[in-house]
């Protein structure tokens, strides 16, 4: 009989309802927007708004100053008051639609929905490791603004996405607001803005460079600002949005749209259309040929990628890399694939795809049905021809108008579908070591941590934990703070370390010592921790075996078993070879000789489950007495394998010696042609591994075997006599004197 | 009149170097991509190089990377190639042309021989 | 890199005559293709651009069509100063490659 070890799911290794307690902090509502700042000399601070209020945190979470910042026309708004006796506008409440750092002063700058949307700018003052905000100026004045013409009107309430620059002295606000009717027709916001801050901090200089949604499209052209950011010399906007002006809004896709860093001014305004898709290895009947696709995004971050992913994608470590969590719709809905999917897209990929575009547009003769496109934001108009006329006039650069490239820039989910069923809600991408992490939020309040590597079909998880007990959703932006990041769920700020909340959820000595370098987890007895929580027994370099089971429970005293051994760390090496004079079995007080391992037998165990096997022949020693005993492993003296060696003992309980009785046999006649079927009775007659019925030397076919009972069918005798028959286990005579008659047929 | 003329041609010995170059007439030749494209005698056409406008980015054939600098003079209206480690391969006449997708004009050619 | 395959490599034919080259890529490249003329001692001219747009100053014989990967050019009634070597070009994608040249020679 050929058993094999049963296989051990690669998730038993871990425990994902572990309890990590991270550090937090109680806002007193739901928190709408948060930002982190560390300076030179050492100080830190964490900024987090509510509605109608601003909290100053220091490094540890605890409140250092807490602002109030509404309602609008309640005297005990603090941000109102700087703006001078009012009134300023509708009173009501405000929130945070824009909470940004101007690196260049260094100060805070917060714009919310009330008051026009205006901002006010909050002086960074450090106090010994802590931050506090001086009184905050109002970036308004009342004589530089009308509702047609709005400079100092940042804010939109439907959602405002803020990056600063700074271009020489000068601090640019690059700007990008979603609009309806009704906004647009209040202190007209722009859809797409740079505005440069004044040096008295007085508001923003007039006469600004803007692209708005047209009058005409406000209706049913909606953008969504979902992310932006500053990288090299360009500044990047995401956004979600119909597809299309003319066909049906509801029918959305994503779009990177790409502004100049380093000149003010919209003329090489850029948009690309980002298409994720998940492609199953295995396509179903039906599916689309170029994958599933994911058209909305739902949260973004860029960041330098590590060496492993690096390699995947096909560019150089460090560099710049966008990566998006898409969803199938708006309502992230379930369909046939994941719930979420993850591409990324390098940024230097995107800057060639969108430089290609213009040059299409601008070469000569262009290619014919070319469009500019942004019909949204200005006259149609086919390349190279500026927005709404009909040629080019020679002191004019075709390049100098915004333009969305014709092609776009598609990739595939790089978890090969694996996030599943969850719903991310955040995203934030660090590089540690040559490893690169994506840290995770979810719709139910949990926090992934997880490598992105493209190449497997499992998810490498750094933790998988609940941040507390309410449930609510990861917010979508996530802040650093040193090698802490920072995330809002409900009314609440977690700090969530980096390198992982800890190491418990590693279940197994193996797992745990397989883990990343960056978590400093070791093995700590019997459980996975960081060296400050076990510091007597922690150790990283070892591993005992662990044994999980055995094959068969059962053997006979006298007579050998071959026994098959489960569990893990028992080479750690695919092969399993198995140097000389390593592995020590005993079975009670009885050695157990290692087997060569049987290289026909070697099968490839998926990376989702494991098991080890160890084969060995167990031959009792003479003292051995009947009953149970334990079976136990000894590694020692094994060569190290990549993460840890092998070495110490494994001990299971369960084995039992037992001694075969033969009772009764019958028929004990039967035709010379053979084939009667003989009945062994007796007791323990299935120990061990090998049994044989002999008659007169030859082995008759055994047909069943049980405990008790034995079914065999009798091979052709020689000639018409009584022959001896026997009954070996495990090559080993049982008791008796038996025979059986061969009689003519 | 759209003008494009190269220079700079002539026998070298294999190892050495040569600098084409080409100027441009009869349009704002800040606004195009330029590339060179080149014709060994009585073969087809290879594409070599090609160069952004503002000179930001430029792209090379596998056989000349590494050994050929495109560049461009904006101010002067010119465009160069420069060949270092010249081949008795890289024997061809040179023509420096306009254009991203597809070349439009072509200069007349300048003749690039390697040889010892 | 894509491959560009020409056939056939020369043709003879008349004046008056309908010629037709084609043009092959390795892979799918839409409608970015380009066909140029060469005659002996001069720099090849653009013919057609965008895989059918004719450009400007090229006469109206010359058609170009096809897209993906399979690609024409016709001449419908040759003349004699058509007598020329013929290249495509892909332009989906960098290196730009060239196809091998047809040279159309009087019968």
């Known amino acids: 009989e050929d058993w094999q070890c049963p296989r051990t799911p690669y998730a038993a290794s871990r425990d994902f309802d572990v309890k990590y307690v991270v550090p937090s902090f109680s806002a007193g509502g739901l928190v709408q927007a948060m930002v982190t700042y560390e300076g030179d000399r050492n100080e830190s601070a964490v900024f987090v708004a509510i509605r109608n209020r601003l909290h100053v945190l220091g490094p540890d979470l605890k409140s250092v100053q807490s602002l109030a910042t509404g309602p609008a026309g309640d005297p005990g708004c603090q941000t109102c008051a700087a703006c001078g006796p009012g009134p300023h506008g509708p009173p009501g409440d405000t929130d945070t639609k824009v909470l940004v750092l101007d690196p260049a002063l260094p100060a805070l700058v917060s714009c919310g929905s009330s008051l026009q949307g205006r901002c006010f700018l909050h002086d960074l003052e450090p106090q010994g490791t802590a931050v506090h905000l001086a009184a905050p100026a109002c970036l308004f004045s009342a004589h530089h603004n009308r509702p047609d013409d709005c400079p100092d009107c940042v804010a939109s309430p439907l959602g405002t996405r803020v990056t600063v620059v700074e271009q020489g002295q000068a601090s640019y606000f690059y700007v990008a607001s979603s609009l309806d009717a009704a906004v647009a027709a209040s202190f007209s916001p722009r859809s797409v803005s740079i505005r440069r801050l004044k040096a008295d901090a007085s508001g923003f200089a007039p006469g600004f460079v803007a692209l708005s949604v047209l009058p005409k499209h406000l209706v049913s052209y909606s953008i969504e600002y979902v992310h932006s950011f500053h990288t090299g010399a360009f500044v990047y906007f995401l956004t979600v949005q119909p597809a299309s002006v003319t066909d049906d809004p509801s029918a959305l896709h994503t779009r990177l749209a790409r502004l100049s860093a380093t000149e003010p001014e919209l003329g090489d305004y850029r948009e690309l259309v980002l298409d994720c898709r998940f492609a199953p290895k295995r396509r179903r009947r039906g599916a689309p040929e170029g994958g599933q696709p994911y058209p909305v995004l739902r949260v973004a971050h860029s960041a330098p990628v590590g060496a492993q992913l690096a390699t995947e994608l096909s560019i150089a470590e460090g560099q710049e890399v966008l990566f998006g969590v898409f969803v199938t719709g708006k309502d992230g809905g379930p369909g046939v694939g994941p719930n979420s999917v993850v591409c990324a897209f390098p940024i230097d990929l995107l800057d060639t795809l969108i430089d290609e575009g213009v040059e299409r547009c601008c070469e000569s003769p262009v290619h014919p049905g070319l469009r500019r496109g942004l019909d949204f934001f200005q006259s149609p108009s086919f390349c190279p021809n500026p927005p709404g006329l009909e040629a080019l006039s020679p002191n004019t650069s075709c390049r100098h108008f915004p333009l969305l490239v014709s092609s776009s820039f598609s990739r595939v989910d790089l978890f090969n579908g694996l996030l599943g069923p969850v719903q991310v809600t955040a995203l934030y991408v660090t590089r540690l070591d040559n490893v690169t992490v994506a840290h995770m939020g979810t719709m139910d309040g949990r926090i992934l941590q997880v490598e992105l590597v493209r190449s497997l079909n499992y998810l490498l998880y750094v933790s998988n934990f609940s941040l507390g007990d309410s449930g609510q959703p990861v917010q979508r932006d996530v802040s650093r703070l040193g090698d802490h990041l920072l995330f809002a769920s409900g009314d609440q700020v977690f700090q969530v370390p980096i390198q992982g909340p800890g190491c418990r959820h590693f279940l197994t000595c193996g797992r745990c010592l397989r883990a990343w370098h960056f978590m400093g987890c070791g093995w700590c007895g019997n459980m996975c921790g960081q060296q400050k929580e076990c510091p007597g027994s922690w150790q990283q370099d070892h591993c005992p075996p662990k044994l999980t089971e055995f094959h068969p429970h059962s053997g006979p005293l006298r007579g050998s078993t071959r026994l098959t051994l489960c569990g893990s760390n028992f080479y750690l090496h695919p092969s399993g070879l198995v140097p000389e004079g390593t592995h020590q079995v005993t079975v009670g007080q009885s050695p157990c000789r290692p087997l060569p391992k049987d290289s026909s037998k070697l099968r490839p165990v998926p990376r989702k489950d494991f098991v080890e096997e160890f084969e060995c022949e167990l031959e009792p020693l003479g003292t051995q007495a009947v009953g149970p005993t334990n079976v136990s492993l000894t590694v020692t003296n094994m060569p190290p394998g990549k993460h840890f060696r092998v070495d110490g003992t494994s001990v299971l309980r369960g084995f039992s010696f037992m001694e075969p009785v033969l009772i009764a046999v019958q028929p004990l006649f039967g035709p010379r042609a053979g084939g009667t079927c003989l009945t062994l009775e007796g007791q323990s007659l299935s120990v061990g591994t090998s049994r044989a019925v002999l008659v007169n030397g030859t082995e008759c076919l055994l047909a069943r075997v049980s405990e008790g009972q034995l079914l065999c069918a009798t091979p052709p005798g020689a000639t018409v006599a009584s022959v001896p028959l026997s009954l070996q286990v495990g090559g080993a005579q049982v008791p008796g004197s038996w025979t059986f008659q061969y009689r003519e047929d | 009149e759209v003008q494009l003329l190269e220079s700079g041609g002539g026998l070298v010995q294999p190892g050495g170097s040569l600098r084409l170059s080409c100027a441009a007439s009869?349009?704002?030749?800040?606004?195009?991509?330029m590339g060179w494209v080149r014709q060994a005698p009585g073969k087809g056409l290879e594409w070599v190089s090609s160069?952004?406008?503002?000179?930001?980015?430029?792209y090379y054939a596998d056989s000349v990377k590494g050994r050929f600098t495109i560049s461009r003079d904006n101010s002067k209206n010119t465009l160069y190639l420069q060949m270092n480690s010249l081949r008795a391969e890289d024997t061809a006449v040179y023509y420096c042309a306009r254009g991203y997708s597809w070349f439009d004009p072509w200069g007349q050619g300048t003749l690039v021989t390697v040889s010892s | 890199d894509i491959q560009m395959t020409q056939s056939p490599s020369s043709v003879s034919a008349s004046v008056g005559d309908r010629v037709t080259i084609t043009c092959r890529a390795s892979q799918g490249i839409s409608s970015w293709l380009a066909w140029y003329q060469q005659k002996p001692g001069k720099a090849p001219k653009l013919l057609i651009y965008a895989a059918s747009s004719l450009q400007s100053g090229v006469p109206s014989r010359f058609s170009g069509s096809g897209s993906g990967t399979d690609f024409t050019l016709t001449i419908s009634s040759l003349q004699p100063e058509d007598f020329a070597t013929y290249y495509c070009?892909?332009?989906?994608?960098?290196?730009?490659?060239f196809g091998q040249g047809t040279k159309v020679e009087i019968k």
């Open positions: 009869g349009f704002t030749f800040s606004n195009y991509m």
């Open positions: 160069i952004y406008f503002s000179g930001g980015k430029t």
């Open positions: 070009q892909q332009a989906n994608s960098f290196p730009r490659t």
